[in-house]
């Protein structure tokens, strides 16, 4: 089966699993709210790689710590 290199830990994998992965199918374009869908080969299920500033299984929550840190950096 086709697989690529493991998911990097940065950005974090919402499913908290590091594994080989495939692209998700077209049907899953809206599976992740603020991130990229990756289909985990071993677990045989989709997972989300969250965009910076988002967390949660579907990257559905803004990471308040990241928001605070970013605003402090600006100051």
């Amino acid at each position: 089966e086709n697989s690529t290199s493991p998911l990097s830990a940065d950005p974090p994998v919402a499913a908290a699993v590091v594994s080989h992965f495939n692209d998700c199918p077209d049907s899953h374009t809206q599976f992740c709210f603020h991130g990229t869908c990756r289909f985990l080969v071993q677990e045989d299920k989709p997972a989300c790689v969250c965009a910076s500033g988002y967390v949660g299984a579907r990257c559905e929550h803004a990471d308040l710590l990241a928001v605070v840190a970013a605003s402090q950096k600006k100051q």
Partner: antibody, heavy 116, light 106 residues
């Protein structure tokens, strides 16, 4: 081991409603979409629609848009398929399913017979 | 996405190597399944991801992919393999199925 257990056969009158269930074990339904498929006697397979149990979002094949309602209860790890205003055309076997790349999972099917 | 099984029926002999084909109208990137169905029974999933044989399915079954063309092979047909076979794409929604290929003994 992942198992999809569907509710038993139903015999209902035309015009009535019915709700079929699919209880999943060995897999958290919030982790992926759950789908329903129809097969009429001696015919092929037809996709009805799907639900994202994590948020309740649904998507239907156009012909089932006004006929079927798919819901899910994450506390019991169960997906449901409800029909309204049943006609003889709805007589079929209905399957719940979830497909991965390496494995696929199907329920055993629920036979729905619409007859007066 | 349309899935076309060019043969609705195939006349075969026991022991034959059987090839069933399925063509997708668009690229589905191997998100394809094969099912076996016997009269009065539920479809039985044989292969997912175009090539991944489901646990418990005999090794005489195999799947392959080339572009938009997908193939189910049975190396030596057994009596219990006489059935109708369906392909299905699950790359995009709506999921779509081929019309089925029925194997009939000569």
């Amino acid at each position: 081991e992942v198992q999809l257990q569907q509710s038993g056969a139903e015999l209902v009158r035309p015009g009535a409603s019915v709700k079929l269930s699919c209880t999943v074990s060995g897999f958290n339904i919030k982790d992926d979409y759950m789908h329903w498929v129809k097969q009429r006697p001696e015919q092929g397979l037809e996709w009805i629609g799907r639900i994202d149990p994590a948020n309740g979002h649904t998507k239907y094949a156009p012909k089932f848009q006004d006929k079927a309602t798919i819901t899910a209860d994450t506390s019991s790890n169960t997906a449901y398929l409800q029909f309204s205003s049943l006609t003889s055309e709805d007589t079929a076997v209905y399957y719940c399913t979830r497909m991965g790349l390496r494995r696929g999972y199907w329920g055993q099917g629920t036979t729905l017979t619409v007859s007066s | 996405i349309q899935m076309t099984q060019s043969s609705s029926s195939l006349s075969v002999s026991l022991g034959d190597r059987v090839t069933i084909t399925c063509k997708a109208s668009e690229h589905i990137n191997s998100w394809l399944a094969w099912y076996q169905q016997k009269p009065g029974n539920a479809p039985r999933l044989l292969i997912s991801g175009a090539t991944n044989l489901k646990t418990g399915v005999p090794s005489r079954f195999s799947g392959s992919a080339s572009g938009k063309d997908y193939t189910l092979n049975i190396t030596s047909l057994q009596t219990e393999d006489v059935a109708t076979y369906y392909c299905q794409q699950y790359w995009g929604t709506p999921w779509t199925f081929g019309g089925g290929t029925k194997l009939e003994i000569k």
